[in-house]
Interface confidence: medium
């Protein structure tokens, strides 16, 4: 029955980019500007998303597909389909309710978004710290002292991973 009904329905012949216009004897009319239909057989066209304010147009609306937005410089997308724009911070910072704040000692963020994460604990893997961590970079772990045969390495064990003059917050 469904198959028979769809064959008799003139609207089923209307392709994407058009709508079945009841006011014009159900002929297929093109979607008007700023609207689209992504599937065939639709009785209305959907209004295109408008990228306003902090949103900017990444992909313009066509008669068969909606517009896509991203965020203006200094912001980044959050949520499905970039439903929100969140402020960027600098590397070494994270966004809080009071704005961008430096990462606490012992944490880092190497991106303009997201939260500060703890430095890797090299000793958990039986390794030593090869390069100290910073607010922007994780520590680099080196081979464990046992892996180094005497006199086979010129690596000097680094000082404790702490930035000079950077007190815990």
């Amino acid at each position: 029955f469904e198959r028979t009904r769809s064959l008799q329905d003139p609207c089923s012949n209307c392709p994407a980019g058009t709508f079945c216009d009841n006011n014009r004897n159900q002929i297929c009319s093109p979607c008007p500007p700023n609207s689209f239909s992504s599937a065939g057989g639709q009785r209305t066209c959907d209004i295109c998303r408008q990228c306003k304010g902090v949103f900017r147009t990444r992909k313009e609306c066509s008669s068969t597909s909606n517009a896509e937005c991203d965020c203006t410089p200094g912001f980044h997308c959050l949520g499905a389909g970039c439903s929100m724009c969140e402020q960027d911070c600098k590397q070494g910072q994270e966004l809080t309710k009071k704005g961008c704040k430096d990462c606490c000692f012992g944490t880092f963020n190497d991106q303009k978004r997201g939260i500060c994460r703890p430095w890797t604990n090299c000793s958990l893997d039986g390794k030593s710290v090869l390069v100290n961590g910073t607010k922007e970079r994780d520590v680099v772990c080196g081979p464990s002292p046992a892996d180094l045969s005497p006199g086979a390495s010129s690596v000097t064990p680094p000082a404790p991973a702490r930035e000079p003059g950077h007190s815990p917050q």
Epitope: N34, T57, E60, S63
Partner: antibody, heavy 116, light 107 residues
Framework: QVQLQQPGAELVKPGASVKLSCKAS????????INWVKQRPGQALEWIGN????????NYNGNFKSKATLTVDRSSSTAYMHLSSLTSKDSAVYYC?????????WGQGTTLTVSS | DILLTQSPAILSVSPGERVSFSCRAS??????IHWYHQRTNGSPRLLIK???ESISGIPSRFSGSGSGTDFTLSINSVESEDFADYYC?????????FGSGTKLEIK
Amino acid sequence: QVQLQQPGAELVKPGASVKLSCKASGYTFTNFWINWVKQRPGQALEWIGNIYPGNDNTNYNGNFKSKATLTVDRSSSTAYMHLSSLTSKDSAVYYCARGQLGLDYWGQGTTLTVSS
Amino acid sequence: DILLTQSPAILSVSPGERVSFSCRASQNIGTAIHWYHQRTNGSPRLLIKFASESISGIPSRFSGSGSGTDFTLSINSVESEDFADYYCQQSNSWPFTFGSGTKLEIK
């Protein structure tokens, strides 16, 4: 930065046809409409039509439907407008412009002269 | 087709003055109007979109207002670089149409 590059001038004979080009750069070509606009000397702007390079959707001003054909070459990010059966009335500056509704970037325009 | 009527054809002002351009549509087009200026031998440049929305890089002295059939572009203090032709354009329905233009000249 966004740029639309057009040849400066074209000279063709009456009755002939011409294919005007508009090379886009600085953005994703398939994501934005390209419009074509005519301006005769001392006259107002006249919208010819537009094309969506992502799927070749086109819309035309009825006055130009038998005159202009819009196409794109995605591999070179270039939009084209083919004008046929040229007469002196087709002598004008032809601009390409990016935008679905408001036209935010424009080429420098191609001056088309139809003369024997 | 939607007809856009711009008036007057020519506006004469002195630098520093405030000036307003009018654009009237032949039918209700909501806020689907955009404003451009075009300097001599140059390409048009988008100034305002959707009647009142500002454009990045355009000086704040340019503003727009209106909805329905009557629209206005204003320059709150004209500078020498503003002397040019001004056009409105509608995107409510195809074909898009432009107004006949208003020439802003130095008094």
